[in-house]
Interface confidence: medium
């Protein structure tokens, strides 16, 4: 549906508040280093322009594309070259190359200071003094640190952020009310960002077909009563929404997401019985709720898959007629019967089925050739089942912190070239799979664990892509999206790695560790553990455990000492010497 003025169309559809918020997110995700005030100025200029177009769609420049309008605005930033270096070269390009250029310069790990949470009273005063600026600042700070954050979902987070301050700044104990809510928003926000980053990586690195396959599998698990044509329509629409958001087209994305939520709610009878509550909520909550809705019950009398996909004499004819539709149907039928499988496992099964048909439909006796295809699925299903069983047993035995440490050692030995902060961040997140998924019954463990691991390993992949240091990481990240986890699981100790030179400074600690939160203290210790493994990759679990136990005792002892700094200096030297001896350094 062509509109004379795209900017006027989106302004009218979204309303001024959402329009301004989404433009701010878009700008902050592109120019991640720009000061808040500069972005607000740019957004206000774009908003004023949009209003002139709403008043008269034929006004000058109103017919320009959003990329042209936004790109032109971003290219007016005076300090572009000083702040962003070669990104300034994007401005010499024409659309659509200019937007592609901006997208390529998005930084998953921008050099920005850590967000420090002020005192509650300070935050409440700032909230009351200027609520609008306070909330814009939240959008800006999240968007610039998470350049692929799902923009319409960030609006939902901002709404919850506002609600938390509105409620808690009036409470008797502001901190007790507010801090848990902010912690929850922070943790959910990080998870949401990582999940969306995988969607964008899937689209950008592996293409629309890969994303659609993922969506068919996930939506078929979630809506097993919906028929294939319904699932196909939802997949097509969802792909458009995520393609737009991942491509920086945030206004179109938010608008289309709202349309999709509307369609789902208008057609919920033919989609899922679980949507009723979601569909009674306001727009942002509704969209979030639909995205998180539990799987509907499976229809009772689903026939055997073998009849249609193995035993039928029409298999090769059906496949030849419309390969992707037939494979889509296979994936739909398999996924709706298996909410107990991870999406990536379902995609591996579909890939195996496709490979078999490609081979067998060219054979002399196709049916004889593909008759046993389902037997090939057994080892593919058992591999993640066994892995999850083993790791959940280890998690239950060790607890989260020590389980993370076991993964830190495991992954540092696999890919020791990766930077220590990345190894710590990724391994800590991998370790969270235990508390997140092992509590679930068998039927929910695999979809929880393996699909979560896909999200975490994608973090490793995007961080590594920025500064590649390991061919093994590159190989696992780029060869196959659905086999990333099995690829990393299969990696053994890197025998080619030359151990890092010992540096006493790395293992020197100071009294400031005593004032850190438990989480920060863990990160310090885990950083030391990674460095130890990099120095001594052949160290045994027992050796590493002994050193880490000594280290924990050392920190505890010195933090109780009267003269903490002296204790850290003197006992630290002894610890380093003892550790070197224990590890044979």
């Amino acid at each position: 549906d062509a509109h004379k003025s795209e900017v006027a169309h989106r302004f009218k559809d979204l309303g001024e508040e959402n329009f301004k918020a989404l433009v701010l997110i878009a700008f902050a995700q592109y120019l991640q280093q720009c000061p808040f005030e500069d972005h607000v100025k740019l957004v206000n200029e774009v908003t004023e322009f949009a209003k002139t177009c709403v008043a008269d769609e034929s006004a000058e420049n109103c017919d320009k594309s959003l990329h042209t309008l936004f790109g032109d605005k971003l290219c007016t930033v005076a300090t572009l070259r000083e702040t962003y270096g070669e990104m300034a070269d994007c401005c010499a390009k024409q659309e659509p190359e200019r937007n592609e250029c901006f997208l390529q310069h998005k930084d998953d790990n921008p050099n920005l200071p850590r967000l420090v949470r002020p005192e509650v009273d300070v935050m409440c005063t700032a909230f009351h003094d200027n609520e609008e600026t306070f909330l814009k600042k939240y959008l800006y700070e999240i968007a610039r640190r998470h350049p692929y954050f799902y923009a319409p979902e960030l609006l939902f987070f901002a709404k919850r952020y506002k609600a938390a301050f509105t409620e808690c700044c009036q409470a008797a104990d502001k901190a007790a009310c507010l801090l848990p809510k902010l912690d929850e928003l922070r943790d959910e926000g990080k998870a949401s960002s990582a999940k969306q980053r995988l969607k964008c990586a899937s689209l950008q690195k592996f293409g629309e077909r890969a994303f659609k396959a993922w969506a068919v599998a996930r939506l078929s698990q979630r809506f097993p009563k919906a028929e294939f044509a319904e699932v196909s329509k939802l997949v097509t629409d969802l792909t458009k929404v995520h393609t737009e958001c991942c491509h920086g087209d945030l206004l179109e994305c938010a608008d289309d997401r709202a349309d999709l939520a509307k369609y789902i709610c208008e057609n919920q009878d033919s989609i899922s019985s679980k949507l009723k509550e979601c569909c009674e909520k306001p727009l942002l909550e509704k969209s979030h709720c639909i995205a998180e809705v539990e799987n509907d019950e499976m229809p009772a009398d689903l026939p055997s898959l073998a009849a249609d996909f193995v035993e039928s004499k029409d298999v090769c004819k059906n496949y030849a007629e419309a390969k992707d539709v037939f494979l889509g149907m296979f994936l739909y039928e398999y996924a709706r019967r298996h909410p107990d499988y991870s999406v990536v496992l379902l995609l591996r099964l579909a890939k195996t089925y496709e490979t078999t048909l490609e081979k067998c439909c060219a054979a002399a006796d196709p049916h004889e050739c593909y008759a046993k295809v389902f037997d090939e699925f057994k080892p593919l299903v058992e591999e993640p089942q066994n892995l999850i069983k083993q790791n959940c047993e280890l998690f239950e035995q060790l607890g989260e912190y020590k389980f993370q440490n076991a993964l830190l050692v495991r992954y540092t030995k696999k890919v020791p070239q990766v930077s220590t902060p990345t190894l710590v961040e990724v391994s800590r997140n991998l370790g969270k799979v235990g508390s997140k998924c092992c509590k679930h019954p068998e039927a929910k463990r695999m979809p929880c664990a393996e699909d979560y691991l896909s999200v975490v390993l994608n973090q490793l992949c995007v961080l590594h892509e920025k500064t590649p240091v390991s061919d093994r990481v590159t190989k696992c990240c780029t060869e196959s999206l659905v086999n990333r986890r099995p690829c990393f699981s299969a990696l053994e100790v890197d025998e080619t790695y030359v151990p890092k030179e010992f540096n006493a400074e790395t293992f020197t600690f100071h009294a400031d560790i005593c004032t850190l939160s438990e989480k920060e203290r863990q990160i310090k210790k885990q950083t030391a553990l990674v460095e130890l493994v990099k120095h001594k990759p052949k160290a045994t679990k027992e050796q590493l455990k002994a050193v880490m136990d000594d280290f924990a005792a050392f920190v505890e002892k010195c933090c109780k000492a009267d003269d903490k700094e002296t204790c850290f200096a003197e006992e630290g030297k002894k610890l380093v010497a003892a550790s070197q001896a224990a590890l044979g350094l």
Partner: nanobody, 125 residues
């Protein structure tokens, strides 16, 4: 939703022929098995013929029409046809086209989700 519209019905003499068409819109036609059913006044709806999804290579017919009726599909035109030859007075009924994404091929009416309004076929003796 999938819309289903039949055409081609009419009055024909016994022994004559008719070709019914059924066109769909609104969804990916290729993913549906298509079927023809008929209902004569005062009788139950009965299965006539069905054709499988995708290539449409598999067909199924009621015993009463085997050898006289042929079902086919043209995916490019989103259309399924029922060629009816050697018509008999007992073939007189409203012929209804239906679409199913429940199975690749089905003769059971409860497995069809989308139905047309029907087209009247009258065979005079």
């Amino acid at each position: 939703q999938l819309q289903v519209v039949e055409s081609g019905g009419g009055l024909v003499q016994a022994g004559g022929s008719l070709r019914l068409s059924c066109t769909t819109s609104g969804r990916a036609f290729i993913g549906y098995a298509m079927g023809w059913f008929r209902q004569a006044p005062g009788k139950e709806r009965e299965f006539v013929a069905a054709i499988s999804w995708f290539a449409g290579d598999t067909t199924d017919y009621a015993n009463s029409v085997k050898g006289r009726f042929t079902i086919s599909r043209d995916n490019a035109k989103n259309t399924v046809y029922l060629q009816m030859n050697s018509l008999k007075p007992e073939d007189t009924a409203v012929y209804v086209c239906a679409a199913s994404s429940a199975r690749p091929l089905s003769s059971r009416s409860d497995e069809y989700h989308y139905w047309g309004q029907g087209t009247q076929v009258t065979v005079s003796s």
